[in-house]
C-alpha cells in the first residue's frame, strides 16, 4: 500500500503533487509498511481494543488562517480515557485516587513502555532496529530521550506526508509559500508502540486556510460604553480602534504596515502607520467603517524580463556583469509583494452619558441624637443622555476592597441633577465610586470621603 491509500481519500491534482512541495515533507506515493503499521478502516472492530480502558481522542488545532508565505502551526493533543495520563518517562499511568468505571487500579501502569524497551532485543549498538522506523522505513531520529516518545504521528495534506515521533502532544509547522490558496485539509493518524510493532489509536482531520489577504480584526473601545461587543457607541466621545493582525509566525514583523481608515461619516480617509486610532462621531446614526491594511511582505519574485535584442552590436560600456539587467536577479534575492487586509463594520452611534461629577456632599442630620450610621447626600450632575440607574461602590481608602455596592433606578430630569443618598456605617475614610447608567452607557466618577465621628460639630470632608 501507498501512503495515499492509507491516509485519506482527498486526492489532490497532479499539479499539486508536482508543484507544491512542502519543505521536509514526502510524496504520498511512497510505500507504507503495513506489517509494522497496520491499517484499519473506520468501523473496524479492532479500534475498540486499540487502547486499554477506552478510546483515545486526538484533538487537532491550527493557527489558521495563514497569510501565504508565513508558517502555519498544527498541534495535536491526545486525550486519554478518564484517570489516565502520561508520566515523565512517557509511560501511561493511572492518576492517583482517581476512580473510573473499573474502580481503582492496582497496577499503576496502563502502558509501561520503559519496561518493554528494556526487554526488547535484536538492536545493534546504536539502539537502531528494524522496528524503530516510521511507516515509510525511515529510522526514528535519536534525540536525547527519544525512547520516552511512544507515539507516531503521520500528518497528511496536499498529497504529502510528514512523520513525527512524539509524546501526548506534538506541534508541526509548515511554510505556506507553496500552498494553494483557500481551504485545505490536514489529516493526522496516530499510532502507539505495541511491542515491536505499532497500533493505530486515533485519526483526526481539520480544515486550515491559506490566504493572500492579511487576516485583520479590529477591537473597539470607548469610555462609558456599556457593551463594547454590540458595535453601538456613544456620540461625542472618542472611540479607540485597535487593529490586530493575525500573524502568529511573525511573518510581517519587518514589514511596514499602513492603515487606511474610512469612518463613514464624511470625514474623509485617514492614513496611519499606527495600529491604533481614535475617532469621535458627532452625529447619531449608522455608519460604515472600512479599514484597508497594506503590508510589503516577502513574496515570489517576478520572472526576469527577456534581455533586449539589439539590432546592431553595441560596444561594451564596462566589465562583464556590470549590466543593470543582469543585476536585477541575484540567487538569494528577497522580493517584496504588497499584501492587503480588509475590515468592515457597521457602527451605530447613539446618545449616552458623557460625564458625571459629584458637585456637593452633605451630611444628613438625623432626628436621633447619636445615630449608629451616617447618611451622606451626594449631589451629582451629568452631561449627555438621561441616566436611569445609579450605582455606588463604597470601598476602603485604596479603592480596592469593596465594602458595599448599591444599585438603584433613578428618575432624573433633563437638567441632569440628582441627589444620591447613601449610608456609611461608622467614621473613617471611604472611597466612593459612583456610576450613572442608561441602556447604552455607564459613566463613572470617584471621590475619597472622610466621615467624621458623630460629634455634631465635626464637618464632612472631601479627602484629598
Amino acid at each position: 500500500k501507498r501512503f495515499h491509500d492509507v491516509l485519506g481519500n482527498e486526492r489532490p491534482s497532479a499539479y499539486m503533487r508536482e508543484h507544491n512541495q512542502l519543505n521536509g515533507w514526502s510524496s504520498d506515493e511512497n510505500d507504507w509498511n503495513e506489517k509494522l503499521y497496520p491499517v484499519w478502516k473506520r468501523g473496524d472492530m479492532r479500534w475498540k481494543n486499540s487502547w486499554k480502558g477506552g478510546r483515545v481522542q486526538a484533538v487537532l488545532t491550527s493557527d489558521s488562517p495563514a497569510l501565504v508565505g508565513s508558517n502555519i502551526t498544527f498541534a495535536v493533543n491526545l486525550i486519554f480515557p478518564r484517570c489516565q495520563k502520561e508520566d515523565a518517562n512517557g509511560n501511561i499511568v493511572y492518576e492517583k485516587n482517581c476512580r473510573n468505571e473499573a474502580g481503582l487500579s492496582a497496577d499503576p501502569y496502563v502502558y509501561n513502555w520503559t519496561a518493554w524497551s528494556e526487554d526488547s532485543d535484536g538492536e545493534n549498538g546504536t539502539g537502531q532496529s528494524h522496528h524503530n522506523v516510521f511507516p515509510d522505513g525511515k529510522p526514528f531520529p535519536h534525540h536525547p530521550g527519544w525512547r520516552r516518545w511512544n507515539f507516531i504521528y503521520v500528518f497528511h495534506t496536499l498529497g504529502q506526508y510528514f512523520q513525527k515521533l512524539g509524546r501526548c502532544s506534538v506541534r508541526v509547522s509548515v511554510n505556506t509559500a507553496n500552498v494553494t490558496l483557500g481551504p485545505q485539509l490536514m489529516e493526522v493518524t496516530v499510532y502507539r508502540r505495541h511491542g515491536r510493532a505499532y497500533v493505530p489509536i486515533a485519526q483526526v482531520k481539520d480544515v486550515y486556510v491559506v490566504t493572500d489577504q492579511i487576516p485583520v480584526f479590529v477591537t473597539m473601545f470607548q469610555k462609558n460604553d456599556r457593551n463594547s461587543s454590540d458595535e453601538t457607541f456613544l456620540k461625542d466621545l472618542p472611540i479607540m480602534f485597535d487593529v490586530l493582525i493575525h500573524d502568529p509566525s511573525h511573518f510581517l514583523n519587518y514589514s511596514t504596515i499602513n492603515y487606511k481608515w474610512s469612518f463613514g461619516d464624511n470625514t474623509g480617509l485617514f492614513v496611519s502607520t499606527n495600529h491604533t486610532v481614535n475617532h469621535t462621531y458627532v452625529l447619531n446614526g449608522t455608519f460604515s467603517l472600512n479599514l484597508t491594511v497594506k503590508a510589503a511582505a516577502p513574496g515570489p519574485c517576478p520572472p526576469p524580463p527577456p534581455p533586449p535584442r539589439p539590432s546592431k552590436p553595441t560596444p561594451s560600456l564596462g566589465p562583464a556583469g556590470d549590466n543593470p539587467l543582469e543585476l536585477s536577479r541575484i540567487p538569494d534575492e528577497n522580493c517584496q509583494i504588497n499584501r492587503y487586509g480588509h475590515f468592515q463594520a457597521t457602527i451605530t452611534i447613539v446618545e449616552g452619558i458623557l460625564e458625571v461629577n459629584i458637585i456637593q456632599m452633605t451630611d444628613v442630620l438625623m432626628p436621633v441624637p447619636w445615630p449608629e450610621s451616617s447618611l451622606i447626600d451626594f449631589v451629582v450632575t451629568c452631561q449627555g443622555s438621561i441616566p436611569t440607574e445609579v450605582c455606588t461602590i463604597i470601598s476602603d481608602p485604596t479603592c480596592e476592597i469593596t465594602q458595599n455596592t448599591v444599585c438603584s433606578p433613578v428618575d432624573v430630569d433633563e437638567m441632569c441633577l440628582l441627589t444620591v443618598r447613601r449610608t456609611f456605617n461608622g467614621s473613617g475614610t471611604y472611597c466612593v465610586n459612583l456610576t450613572l447608567g442608561d441602556d447604552t452607557s455607564l459613566a463613572l466618577t470617584s471621590t475619597l470621603i472622610s466621615v467624621p465621628d458623630r460629634d455634631p460639630a465635626s464637618p464632612l470632608r472631601m479627602a484629598n
Epitope: 436611569t388 448599591v406 433606578p409 428618575d411
Partner: antibody
Amino acid sequence: EVQLLESGGGLVQPGGSLRLSCAASGFTFRKLNMSWVRQAPGKGLEWVSSISHSGGSKYYADSVKGRFTISRDNSKNTLYLQMNSLRAEDTAVYYCARKWSTFDYWGQGTLVTVSS
Amino acid sequence: QSVLTQPPSASGTPGQRVTISCSGSSSNIGNNYVSWYQQLPGTAPKLLIYADSQRPSGVPDRFSGSKSGTSASLAISGLRSEDEADYYCGAWDSSLNAYVFGGGTKLTVLG
C-alpha cells in the same frame, strides 16, 4: 395636567392572557420611566414592573417574571403590560404610575379578575 | 409578608400628632430613598413624601417624613378627619432588584 388612563382589564380564565394599556398625557412621556403597581382586593400595594424611558431597561417582580412583559410606544405615549398564563392570585386593580424610583402620579386603575 | 414592616393600624383624635413607622434593611431603606403614599378609600394612591422627607407641591406641611438608619417614619400633625386613609411606605430594594412596599397602615381619626 398629568393624566394616566388605564384600560384593557376584565374577566379572564386561569391560563389566559390580557393586555393592559396606559395612555399618558400632560408630560413628555418619552423622557420618563414608567411602572405598573397592583392591589389585590382588600390587600396592600404590590409593585409589578418598571421600564426605562427608552424601553431598554426593564424590571419585574419575581411573582410575574416570565409571564408578564412591560413595553412602551413613545410615539403613541402609551405604556403596556402583556399578561400571560394568568393565575387567580393575579386578580387585582392594576395601576399605571409615572417614574420608577418613586411613583409621583397614578392612574385610576383597571380591574383584572382571573376566575373560572 | 411585606419586606418593609408597618403597623397595621394607627389612630388619633383631630388636632393630634400621629407617627407611622416603617422598618426595613440596608438594601432598601438604609441605602435608598423612602416614599410615602396616601390612599383614601376607593381612590388611587397619591404621593405624599419622596426622597425620605421631601413634599411634592400641593401636599400640606402637616405631613413630614424622616429616616434614621434602616427605619423611616411619617408624621402627621394637626390631624384632620380627611386624613383617614391607608398609608404605605415604599423604597427600591437593591438586593431584590425590586420596588418594595410596606403592608400599609390604616389610620383612623377618632371622634
